[in-house]
Every structure is written in structure tokens, then in C-alpha cells.
């Protein structure tokens, strides 16, 4: 190797200056005694190199790039060799930003996978490899005192969420949780959450069903629907409140919300609807009165209201 580049820093803030030096060894005898060292950033020649012969006979060129505005580029030093450019050495330069503070950190406890899933927003692009780590600890109190640390959770590349498995969780005890972002230019940490995994539990919704007509039960009135639901068994012992939403299948009507309904209602007569109309219905539930997250809406149930009784039957319906 005839030449060697060294740089003040291979990674800098975008727009910052960078200084580089290229030294050509004296024993490169095939070179001119006074070779002119040229600089190139990417494909562009860069003027402004200051060249000098050092006491040991080596040649040095120093260049300062006033603003590195490329997020990634190769800086090379070269010599004219005949009528071509002979590259002596090159280095990769990176420029970007330190990580912003990750924000909107939130978590939910999934009882099916037995894990606490936390997600966050990483902030603006840094243009540099940036690692995110979900850090946590167990705490007896309100997270002012740190208990056992929990193994760091490292998301897969490009993901802004991570799952803490059950073996690292303690239900009904607080955990301190935060995200640390790190790259070559710095480290930042999100505000810390303090939570009991059960207080962020997200249940699965019940399954809506049509109520089987029983011989002794009166049929639904016009504009009414009779429905029932089967609770999600693994969450059966958790007190919940639920809500229904419904809308006519045809037309542009928005969802109408009905609730709160206790999970234990298990069956319900919904009235005040249009007669002889097909409706789409969904249900969702949340741990209550203790804290929790709403479940997703259940798969839709499609039901049709009965027709209004003919007028000559003299039946009066009270809604």
C-alpha cells in the first residue's frame, strides 16, 4: 500500500466539517519524486488539499471538507498515473444525527402469548445504524426504587416493538420500562413507563352468536335483534365491560355504539333498529373496573331484523 488516509472522524453530524490526511510512503519508488495528491469525494474531485513533504521523506496532503452533506460517501486520495487516476486509499464517511428521544412508548399484555409487547415511535431518520433496546426492571413500589433488572429486549432490525416473555414478568407488580436508542453520535432514552403488566392487559373479544330461538321465548319485536356472546375463556375470570356497535349493511351509515354492557350479560336484545334490515354487529371488551386495553372488535355477526307486523293485526309494539 502506497497511501493511507486518516480522518478526524469517520462519522459526523450531517453538515459538519471533516478533516482528512493522506500520506504517501517514500519507498513507493515508482512514483514521481514530487507527486501531486488529488482528493475525490464520491465521483467529484475536491480542491483545497494542502500538500507537504515531511522530514522522513513521505508526502502528506491534508484537506478539510467544510460541510459533509452526504449521509454516506467514499473519500479517496489518488495520483495521476499516466492519463488515469490511481487511487491510493479510500475511507467511508458517514454523516447523520444522534438519535432523537423515542416517544409514545406503550405496552400491552397478551395473555395468549404470555408476553408484554411494547412499541414506540423512534423519531426522525438518523441516517446512521441506530440500535434500539427495550430496558426494564422489576420494582416493588412505584419504580422509584429499582429491583431486579430484566434481560434487555432487542427488536429485530427495523422494528419498533419488542416482546418481553412471561419468564421475565411478574404480574401484579410494577415494572420500569424505557427505550434506549444508540448510534455513533449519541444515546437517548425515552421517558420511563411504570406499569403492572396486568394493568395493560388486552383481552380477546367475545364471539357474537345468534340467540337460538326457544319455543317458550317470544320472537323479537320488529326492529329488534336478539344476540348472545361467548366470552373468551382465558379471560373469563377478569371483570370486564363490553360495548356493541352496529350499522345497516347497506348504505353509508356510521357505526352506532351501545354500552357499556357487562360481560356477564351474555345475551342482549337490541331494539330501535329499522325493521326488515340486515345489520352488521361487533363487540369488544375491556378489563373493568381495573385498568386495561380495549380488545379488538370481534368478527362481525350479520343479522336481519324482523318485519313490522301488518297494520290489520292490531298489534301494538312499544319501544
Amino acid at each position: 500500500e502506497c497511501g493511507h488516509i486518516s480522518v478526524s472522524a469517520p462519522i459526523v453530524h450531517l453538515g459538519d466539517p471533516i478533516t482528512a490526511s493522506c500520506i504517501i510512503k517514500q519507498n513507493c519508488s515508482h512514483l514521481d519524486p514530487e507527486p501531486q495528491i488529488l482528493w475525490r469525494l464520491g465521483a467529484e474531485l475536491q480542491p483545497g488539499g494542502r500538500q507537504q513533504r515531511l522530514s522522513d521523506g513521505t508526502q502528506e496532503s491534508i484537506i478539510t471538507l467544510p460541510h459533509l452533506n452526504h449521509t454516506q460517501a467514499f473519500l479517496s486520495c489518488a495520483l495521476n498515473w499516466g492519463n488515469s487516476l490511481q487511487i491510493l486509499d479510500q475511507v467511508e464517511l458517514r454523516a447523520g444525527y444522534p438519535p432523537a428521544i423515542p416517544h409514545n412508548l406503550s405496552c400491552l399484555m397478551n395473555l395468549t402469548t404470555s408476553s408484554l409487547i411494547c412499541q414506540w415511535e423512534p423519531g426522525p431518520e438518523t441516517h446512521l445504524p441506530t440500535s434500539f433496546t427495550l430496558k426494564s426492571f422489576k420494582s416493588r413500589g412505584n419504580c422509584q426504587t429499582q429491583g431486579d433488572s430484566i434481560l434487555d429486549c432487542v427488536p429485530k432490525d427495523g422494528q419498533s416493538h419488542c416482546s418481553i416473555p412471561r419468564k421475565h414478568l411478574l404480574l401484579y407488580q410494577n415494572m420500569g420500562i424505557w427505550v434506549q436508542a444508540e448510534n455513533a453520535l449519541g444515546t437517548s432514552m425515552s421517558p420511563q413507563l411504570c406499569l403492572d403488566p396486568m394493568d395493560v392487559v388486552k383481552l380477546e373479544p367475545p364471539m357474537l352468536r345468534t340467540m337460538d330461538p326457544s319455543p317458550e321465548a317470544a320472537p323479537p319485536q320488529a326492529g329488534c335483534l336478539q344476540l348472545s356472546w361467548e366470552p373468551w375463556q382465558p379471560g373469563l375470570h377478569i371483570n370486564q365491560k363490553c360495548e356493541l356497535r352496529h350499522k345497516p349493511q347497506r348504505g353509508e351509515a356510521s357505526w352506532a355504539l351501545v354500552g357499556p354492557l357487562p360481560l356477564e350479560a351474555l345475551q342482549y336484545e337490541l331494539c330501535g333498529l329499522l325493521p326488515a334490515t340486515a345489520y352488521t354487529l361487533q363487540i369488544r371488551c375491556i378489563r373493568w373496573p381495573l385498568p386495561g386495553h380495549w380488545s379488538d372488535w370481534s368478527p362481525s355477526l350479520e343479522l336481519r331484523t324482523t318485519e313490522r307486523a301488518p297494520t290489520h293485526h292490531h298489534h301494538h309494539h312499544h319501544h
Epitope: 404470555s114 419468564k167 375463556q233 373469563l236 375470570h237 377478569i238 356477564e264
Partner: antibody, heavy 118, light 107 residues
Framework: EVQLLESGGGLVQPGGSLRLSCAAS????????MGWVRQAPGKGLEWVSS????????PYADSVKGRFTISRDNSKNTLYLQMNSLRAEDTAVYYC???????????WGQGTLVTVSS | DIQMTQSPSSLSASVGDRVTITCRAS??????LNWYQQKPGKAPKLLIY???NLQNGVPSRFSGSGSGTDFTLTISSLQPEDFATYYC?????????FGGGTKVEIK
């Protein structure tokens, strides 16, 4: 301190009836599922029945379905088990217990012995 | 219905021994597995809930692990007061079921 105190056990003839009670204190009774678990002499634990916080959901073990009825009175903080058509194989210590949110039993009462024998 | 198979049904051990009891579910039950200790003439006492959570007041020598179908209760260093019968209990859906029990006796 959470306490559960069973009563109502005793000797009864096959085909007879008995009503067990469980008085609860030290927690908000109306917010929790409750349950009955029994243990025949020298045998393991067997779940009998549970009841939801407001009494609307009442699953039973197949071995007692149609014969036993679980109920609760939230105003009296009391759980009941009405046992009809009793059989010799129903002989056991009956425990009442509070259910946790993910279905575990804690704490348990001290138990009451039911003996079905002629 | 889900069956819970507990093994061994009994074991002899000495004070200070590490003891492991296993419980196998006939199908996957996520982490809905609890462990109880029962001493003669007494009501059962909850040790571990949701597979690995130590109940308040239970010594840290007790630990639970596993998920899906295979679960383990470990006593890291057996103490004189630990000689008792241990039961696993499945609580994900009805009917709730218990394992057959493991009696831990003095060698």
C-alpha cells in the same frame, strides 16, 4: 386479611341434600369469581363449580352437573353450594376459594367435611 | 377436556436437595398453570400462578417454569417445612382440572 369460612357440612344419607355456606371477609366480595373444590379422603383435588362476580356464569364439573347448584349473595358476602341427590362418591372435604383473574384459587377456606353414608 | 398428568406421584428427598416436579397438559394451555402446596389436614396454599409468578409470601426457593404443555415446579433447596403434597392446576378454560399430586417425603 382475606378470610373464607365454610359451614354446613355433616353426615347425610344417599339421595339427601345439604347446603354449604362460605362467609367471606377482607376483600370486595362482589368483584371476584368464587369456587368450590373438593377432596375425597386420601385423594387429590377436584374442582366442583365456580360462579362469576355477579352470579351470571356458573360452570360445573360433569360429576355434579344437575345435582349441585352454586349461588352467591353479594349483599351478605356469602357463597353457597346446594347439594342434592347426594351419593357416596360425593364424600369429601369441600373447600371454598376466591379465584384470581387468571383462574387460580387463593386463598382457600379451612374446608368442611361432607359424609354421604347410610 | 384437558387432562393434567403430574409426575412423579411421590418422591423421597433430603433437606437441601433440589426437587423438580413436572406437569404435562394434554394440549397447549399457554401459561395458565398454577401450583399449590398442601399439608395433611390443611387447605391447599397457592405457590405459583400463571406458570412462573411467585405468590406473595412464598419463599424464593420455589420457582415455576414452562409454557404450552410442559411445566415444572422446582424447589432449589428443600427445607423441613416443604415436605407436603404438591398439585398443579390448569385454569385457562372450564372444566378446571388438577394434576394427581406429588407427595414429597423425607428420605
Amino acid at each position: 386479611e382475606v378470610q373464607l369460612l365454610e359451614s354446613g357440612g355433616g353426615l347425610v344419607q344417599p339421595g339427601g341434600s345439604l347446603r354449604l355456606s362460605c362467609a367471606a371477609s377482607g376483600f370486595t366480595f362482589s368483584l371476584y369469581w368464587m369456587g368450590w373444590v373438593r377432596q375425597a379422603p386420601g385423594k387429590g383435588l377436584e374442582w366442583v363449580s365456580s360462579i362469576s362476580s355477579s352470579g351470571g356464569v356458573t360452570p360445573y364439573a360433569d360429576s355434579v352437573k344437575g345435582r349441585f347448584t352454586i349461588s352467591r349473595d353479594n349483599s351478605k358476602n356469602t357463597l353457597y353450594l346446594q347439594m342434592n341427590s347426594l351419593r357416596a362418591e360425593d364424600t369429601a372435604v369441600y373447600y371454598c376459594a376466591k379465584l384470581g383473574e387468571l383462574g387460580w384459587f387463593d386463598p382457600w377456606g379451612q374446608g368442611t367435611l361432607v359424609t354421604v353414608s347410610s | 377436556d384437558i387432562q393434567m398428568t403430574q409426575s412423579p406421584s411421590s418422591l423421597s428427598a433430603s433437606v437441601g436437595d433440589r426437587v423438580t416436579i413436572t406437569c404435562r397438559a394434554s394440549q397447549g394451555i399457554s401459561s395458565y398453570l398454577n401450583w399449590y402446596q398442601q399439608k395433611p389436614g390443611k387447605a391447599p396454599k397457592l405457590l405459583i400462578y400463571y406458570a412462573s409468578n411467585l405468590q406473595n409470601g412464598v419463599p424464593s426457593r420455589f420457582s415455576g417454569s414452562g409454557s404450552g404443555t410442559d411445566f415444572t415446579l422446582t424447589i432449589s433447596s428443600l427445607q423441613p417445612e416443604d415436605f407436603a403434597t404438591y398439585y398443579c392446576h390448569f385454569s385457562m378454560q372450564y372444566p378446571l382440572t388438577f394434576g394427581g399430586g406429588t407427595k414429597v417425603e423425607i428420605k
